[in-house]
Interface confidence: low
């Protein structure tokens, strides 16, 4: 029997450019005469355009909703019924190749057209995307709020604020035609629950979505977008009520940047430059295309590229890239952003060099990508160190610490996280290297003691990159590197002369004088330790909170003893800047650290003193006896200790940790307390300082309190952010 | 708070259609999509499909199309499925289910019981 | 069509012990996987989404990782009450499947 024909709604967006009008300000107004004019001329115009073409037995509707300059732009969309076998024959670019056919066909002809009554329609400038009615639906819920602006070459046009009234506003942004738009958002509200959509064409079409942010995200205070050419839009969705804008955005256009370049690299290890998406820290743009060609001096070397919060990963079957598309040596992979390190180690076979492709495979982008590049020795990855296959990282091996996620630096070790003595393969314990007590059996652990030697996972590296076989070396007093930077930096970790935390004692005056208590509006929040002039560490967790996440909230006291009561000791600072680390996880509590710049810098008293930093090879010797402090609960669920607490706790292997946590133990963990439980950092501790004392007197700084299961339970020690795991994101923020 | 509340168990006869409603409250079904999903005793679950009930697109399993039909009704903020030519093989237990955006299923209905016997 | 295999149908288990499901997909779904409980008469509670991402409310002892296109439904401690059957899903594109289900019983 006869079958009806299923018909499917196709829905098309687009642009096309008038050559005999021109653009006022009146259309940008859509109440005003001026507008209804122009978009019923348009509107017929557009009609009878389409129904001159074989589209014309399928029209069902459309809309001109906007215009723009050049010399003047319409903006619409349309709507036509298709049979659904037809479907796919009628893309964007067919529906675009018929109506600029019919165009061209009518250029210099002398009969009546229709649609060329009003209007000199440039055939080059008709542009036809794939749109869908939920598309429209979100371009018409804005259309009591749009705004359209034509931002000039060197002009960064600030754009007015969305109308509270409104539950949605679009900007309609247009620049120069050669030009690419670039968009700034800043977040200027600590909390909000606004979404703002981008797209990479005049109106917001979910397959041209080029990022979405979504209330005043404090991992992304300011966010810049690029388009990929001189369109964009820009989509607000109302949050909470507010008078207040949570953001401010601004335009500006921007020149194409070329993203290619040839290199030849230097005959040296390590870092040797950057390469960078255009305009990076912006978001990469919708049609980005990088080429980076790299010229390796020796068949020695491979080629090692860095980079930060950002992994290269195989993608299976031809699935479209998210993050970015990179191919290198014909090997095609995809980037995928992670809150962790990553090198990608590409083998050198031949002379020619390497070409890295970066491509923005669909018009959603993110952050710009940056990586360092540099060589390293293909015979010898990692001297002294284990090549992680997983994410191409040099890592310390047998150091007691599963630092590669496959855990393989720990396996295959004669001699875990202690000294092997040359003669037999005997195991020591680290403190006894180098102590002046041979104590393997023909001494070899006094040996180079004087001498520079091969770096390695305990060896200390010197301001001049030499190491030294001494483990850790630092301010005890003797200089141990030829340069003698061990014993650099050293005014800190001495206690005051002076004469909670579950199962404590109280402190004196001047016994823990870095110790900082953070509060807000009057009452203690976090504990924290002063580690430079200007700067108190503490844990990232105590600001997960959006309301506790603004400097302003902040005071931070050091010197305090008691919380009721001051003393002429104490000092109160205000907050200048917060610093999470980049590569921190709620969940997971990985990462958990952050800085605090005070708004000036302290003087240093008998009650306040930094603790000691130290260096990435230092041991922390599992069994070693350590200190927190701190004026958390006295015990689980209570409330928080008016004197300064102190407990000593034990340093725990991490494997036996790690498995008492159910594997939830990162290398940046270290875990401290007892098998019995009652010692241990409680609520309010957040933040607060592990120390442990050098044969030196001085006091290091091991760990920060960051999680744990209760406070002192029996067989759940006390989890600590681990300072050697993050001190180089430390060090290169306080120097 | 939340909630889906599914209609009654139901008795069909075989070729018989039958129409399951799902009643929303705590939301507004027009801000999520609703998913509807089969259940039979050893044989897991099974997507059936999904409406979004603001424009009343409409997505299907390919082994439901033609089986399933699924409206939206706005007003009372119901989803309604309608099962045609049922079988034996229809006899199971239907869940309806909501959904935000790219998100799975965070609440379901509590089920409702198709026997399809003459 | 994407497939989501649950190779065991039914897993034995005691209190306090730690139990991994896993669940494996024909296909790259990136992180778009779910995973439900469904207790006897009782519709399917979501546990997991986006392979990781804990649903509020849902007990800490539950974790979903990733390894490869292999999803794993973590149980740190399993307790009288999680006794049921898990199901995974792929919420990549649809049609969405889910896997044939876990019936975790105690030993």
């Known amino acids: 029997g006869y079958k009806a024909e299923v018909m499917v709604s196709q829905v098309y967006s687009g642009s096309l450019r008038v050559l005999n009008r021109h653009f006022s300000q009146d259309l940008t107004r859509r109440e005003s005469s001026a507008f209804r004019s122009e978009t019923a001329k348009a509107q017929k115009m557009l009609k009878e355009l389409i129904t001159s073409t074989r589209l014309g037995t399928y029209y069902n509707s459309s809309s001109v909703y906007s215009f723009g300059e050049g010399p003047l732009t319409c903006f619409f969309w349309f709507i036509l019924q298709i049979p659904e076998h037809r479907r796919l024959m009628l893309s964007p670019e067919v529906v675009q190749a018929l109506l600029v056919e019919e165009l061209l066909s009518t250029v210099n002809s002398s009969a009546a057209v229709p649609y060329r009554a009003e209007y000199e329609v440039d055939p080059e400038g008709l542009v036809i995307l794939e749109a869908s009615v939920k598309d429209i639906a979100a371009l018409n819920s804005t259309l009591g709020c749009y705004r359209y602006s034509y931002v000039g070459q060197g002009q960064v046009l600030r754009l007015k604020g969305p109308d509270h009234l409104a539950s949605s506003c679009l900007w309609h942004l247009q620049g120069p035609k050669d030009l690419m738009l670039k968009l700034r958002l800043e977040w200027t509200l600590a909390e909000c629950r606004d979404r703002l959509a981008m797209y990479d064409v005049a109106g917001p079409l979910e397959k041209r979505l080029i990022t979405s942010v979504y209330g005043c995200s404090r991992q992304e205070p300011v966010v810049e977008v690029l388009a990929s050419g001189a369109i964009m839009a820009v989509v607000w969705k109302k949050g909470l009520h507010s008078y207040y804008d949570p953001f401010v955005l601004s335009v500006q256009p921007v020149v194409f940047q070329a993203c290619e370049v040839n290199l030849t690299l230097d005959n040296r290890l390590d870092s040797q430059g950057v390469l960078s998406t255009p305009y990076f820290p912006s978001y990469y743009s919708p049609q980005t295309h990088c080429s980076w060609h790299l010229t390796v001096p020796s068949l020695d070397y491979g080629l090692a590229l860095w980079f930060d919060a950002y992994a290269l990963r195989r993608q299976k079957y031809d699935l479209p890239c998210t993050q970015g598309q990179w191919t290198i040596q014909n090997r095609r992979l995809c980037g995928l952003r992670i809150l962790q390190p990553y090198a990608e180690r590409i083998p050198v076979v031949a002379t020619a060099g390497i070409t890295i492709n970066f491509t923005s495979q669909i018009s959603l982008t993110g952050p710009g990508v940056r990586v360092h590049y540099g060589l390293y020795n293909q015979s010898d990855p990692c001297p002294g160190e284990f090549l992680c296959s997983v994410n191409g990282l040099c890592v310390p091996a047998c150091d007691g610490v599963k630092d590669c996620p496959n855990g393989l630096d720990e396996r295959n070790c004669v001699c875990r996280a202690t000294f092997q003595c040359k003669e037999d393969s005997t195991c020591i314990s680290l403190p006894k290297v180098c102590d002046g007590q041979p104590d393997c059996l023909n001494g070899s652990d006094e040996e180079q003691c004087q001498e520079g030697v091969p770096c390695g996972t305990f060896t200390f590296q010197c301001e001049d990159r030499s190491c030294v076989k001494k483990p850790n070396p630092q301010c005890d007093g003797r200089p141990d590197c030829r340069d003698g930077s061990d014993e650099e930096h050293c005014d800190c970790g001495l206690q005051g002369p002076s004469s909670r935390i579950v199962g404590g004692a109280v402190s004196s005056e001047g016994e823990w004088p870095w110790q900082a208590s953070l509060q807000v509006r009057g009452r203690h929040i976090c504990g924290g330790a002063l580690i430079a002039d200007r700067w108190v560490i503490t844990a990232a967790h105590c600001f997960q909170e959006d309301s506790m996440a603004s400097t302003v909230l902040w005071t931070v006291f050091l010197g305090k003893v008691w919380q009721n009561s001051r003393w002429p000791g104490e000092v109160s600072f205000k907050v200048s800047r917060l610093l999470l680390h980049p590569y921190h996880e709620e969940d997971s509590h990985d990462y958990d650290v952050a800085l605090l710049q005070l708004d000036h810098p302290v003087v240093r008293s008998a009650a306040v003193r930094p603790v000691c930093l130290p260096a990435r090879s230092h041991f922390f010797e599992p069994g070693l006896h350590c200190w927190i402090t701190g004026w958390g609960a006295l015990r689980e669920g209570g409330p928080i200790s008016n004197a300064l607490q102190k407990v000593d706790v034990q340093l725990i292997p991490q494997d036996l940790c790690s498995e008492v946590y159910r594997y939830q133990v990162t290398p940046r963990m270290l875990c401290a307390g007892y098998r019995k439980g009652k010692k241990d950092a409680c609520q309010g501790d957040s933040g607060g300082p592990l120390v442990c004392k050098a044969l030196s007197g001085r006091w290091f700084l091991a760990g920060l309190v960051s999680w744990g299961l209760g406070c002192g339970r029996p067989n759940y020690f006390g989890v600590y952010t681990r300072i050697t795991g993050v001190i180089s994101w430390i060090q290169q923020v306080v120097t | 708070e939340v909630q889906l509340q599914q209609s009654g168990a139901e008795l069909v006869k075989p070729g018989a259609s039958v129409k399951l409603s799902c009643t929303a409250s705590?939301?507004?079904?027009?801000?999520?999509?609703i998913h509807w999903v089969k259940e039979r005793t050893e044989q897991g679950l099974e997507w059936i499909g999904r409406?979004?009930?603001?424009?009343?697109?409409?997505t299907y399993a390919p082994q439901f199309q033609g089986k399933a039909t699924i409206i939206p009704d706005t007003s009372s903020n119901t989803a309604y499925m309608q099962l045609s030519s049922l079988t034996s093989e229809d006899a199971a237990v239907y869940y309806c289910?909501?959904?935000?955006?790219?998100?799975?299923?965070?609440?379901w209905g509590q089920g409702t019981s198709v026997t399809v016997s003459s | 069509d994407i497939v989501m295999t649950q190779s065991h149908k039914f897993m034995s288990t005691s209190v306090g012990d730690r139990v991994s499901i896993t669940c494996k997909a024909s296909?790259?779904?990136?992180?778009?996987v779910a995973w439900y409980q469904q207790k006897p008469g009782q519709s399917p509670k979501i546990l997991i989404y986006?392979?990781?991402t804990r649903h509020t409310g849902v007990p800490d002892r539950f974790t979903g990782s990733i390894s490869g296109t292999t999803y794993i439904l973590t149980i740190s401690s399993v307790q009288a009450e999680d006794l049921a059957l898990y199901y995974c899903?792929?919420?990549?594109?649809?049609?969405?499947?889910f896997g044939g289900g876990t019936k975790l019983e105690i030993k």
């Open positions: 289910a909501r959904s935000i955006y790219l998100d799975p299923m965070d609440y």
């Open positions: 296909q790259d779904v990136t992180t778009a």
């Open positions: 986006w392979a990781t």
């Open positions: 409406i979004d009930p603001e424009d009343g697109e409409t």
């Open positions: 705590g939301f507004n079904i027009e801000d999520y999509y």
């Open positions: 899903q792929q919420h990549y594109s649809t049609p969405y499947t």
